[in-house]
């Protein structure tokens, strides 16, 4: 039975050419971690593996880093890269739990106008 | 053209050691991580572990993780794996390949290792 | 981590045959799977990946399918030069090989 749940950063806006960390954290479970893979839509970004450690696809490698923990950090980001990104936690003998995040990159200045006009 | 051109056949006695290269050409060899994997007769492709030549960090399956020891020499863009403790059942064709992400785009010519007494 | 295994373990076939090889996952395999070919005494060559993209210079004769737990591996007609033995991998969750596929001249 799979009791474990996971928690993520859910819904984060970054700026564009700034940087993000993707987070997820597996909890309620004794499952063993066996690999997480990260994916945004349908493309694999990255894999860790609990024996052989990071594996960046080459599409990404320039913009994208392992890291910290088993979470992800995109760089250099673009508007491009608005949407939704999944970490699959692939755990034995559970199975494969996984964590949705929605990521929106905004133009600087819509940040820096939007930012401007927060209400406290 | 990328290859990887690996050291000749060994035969050893069992306990000894043994120690296989792979010398790559034809790109950049700190780009990429090197694999080490083993096909013993009538056995499944089995992979034993890895290393990024940037750093020279290493990574070993569990099965092997006492007993194999993976490093490289950037200077000669070069490989190695080392296994220890040998007995029969290590008697197999050891390959390196270059791994492309996630999957392995080029392999040596694998190394033929007999352990027999 | 997955296990694959392929099936058949051998086949029989002969230049001009259509061949399909089989290879299926214990868990979802989610399209991360490549297919190798493999020649005696000579290093493993890859053909497929991510199910269906053939490596740049594998003939058009070679092509991938599949999703979720099974996959195939299918030589449109076989080539006196395609007799060898044929192996899936896959990296959804671990780095696993199938036992292999013998094609052989019949």
């Known amino acids: 039975m799979m009791t474990g749940t996971i928690e993520t950063t859910g819904n984060i806006s970054a700026e564009k050419g700034g940087s993000i960390i993707l987070q997820c954290h597996l909890s309620s479970t004794t499952a063993q971690v066996t690999q997480v893979n990260w994916e945004q839509q349908d493309q694999l970004l990255a894999i860790c593996n609990a024996d052989l450690g990071w594996h960046i696809s080459p599409s990404f490698k320039d913009r994208v880093a392992p890291g910290p923990g088993l979470g992800l950090t995109l760089q250099s980001l673009t508007v491009n890269d608005t949407g939704e990104y999944f970490c699959i936690y692939h755990t034995y003998p559970d199975g494969a739990y996984t964590g949705r995040i929605f990521l929106e990159v905004l133009e600087s200045s819509v940040a820096e106008h939007g930012a401007r006009f927060q209400i406290p | 053209e990328v290859q990887l051109v690996q050291s000749g056949a060994e035969v050893k006695k069992p306990g000894a050691s043994v120690k296989v290269s792979c010398k790559a050409s034809?790109?950049?060899?700190?780009?990429?991580?090197i694999y080490w994997v083993r096909q013993a007769p009538g056995q499944r492709l089995e992979i034993m572990g890895r290393?990024?030549?940037?750093?020279?960090?290493?990574y070993y399956v569990d099965k092997f993780k006492n007993r194999v020891t993976i490093t490289r020499d950037t200077s000669a863009s070069t490989a190695y794996m080392e296994l220890s403790s040998l007995r029969s059942e290590d008697t197999a064709v050891y390959y390196c390949?270059?791994?492309?992400?996630?999957?392995?785009?080029?392999w040596g010519q694998g190394t033929l290792v007999t352990v027999s007494s | 981590d997955i296990q694959l295994t392929q099936s058949p373990s051998f086949l029989s076939a002969s230049v001009g045959d259509r061949v399909t090889i089989t290879c299926k996952g214990s868990?979802?395999?989610?399209?991360?799977l490549v297919w190798y070919q493999q020649k005696p005494g000579k290093a493993p060559k890859l053909l497929i990946y991510?199910?269906?993209n053939l490596q740049s210079g594998v003939p058009s004769r070679f092509s991938g399918s599949g999703s979720g737990t099974e996959y195939t591996l299918t030589i449109s007609s076989l080539q006196p030069e395609d007799f060898a033995t044929y192996y899936c991998?896959?990296?959804?969750?671990?780095?696993?090989f199938g036992q292999g596929t013998k094609v052989e001249i019949k």
């Open positions: 868990q979802n395999v989610n399209k991360y």
């Open positions: 290393i990024d030549p940037k750093n020279g960090r290493t």
């Open positions: 390949a270059r791994i492309y992400g996630f999957y392995f785009d080029f």
């Open positions: 034809g790109y950049t060899f700190t780009e990429y991580s």
């Open positions: 991510n199910t269906d």
């Open positions: 991998y896959q990296y959804n969750n671990g780095f696993t």
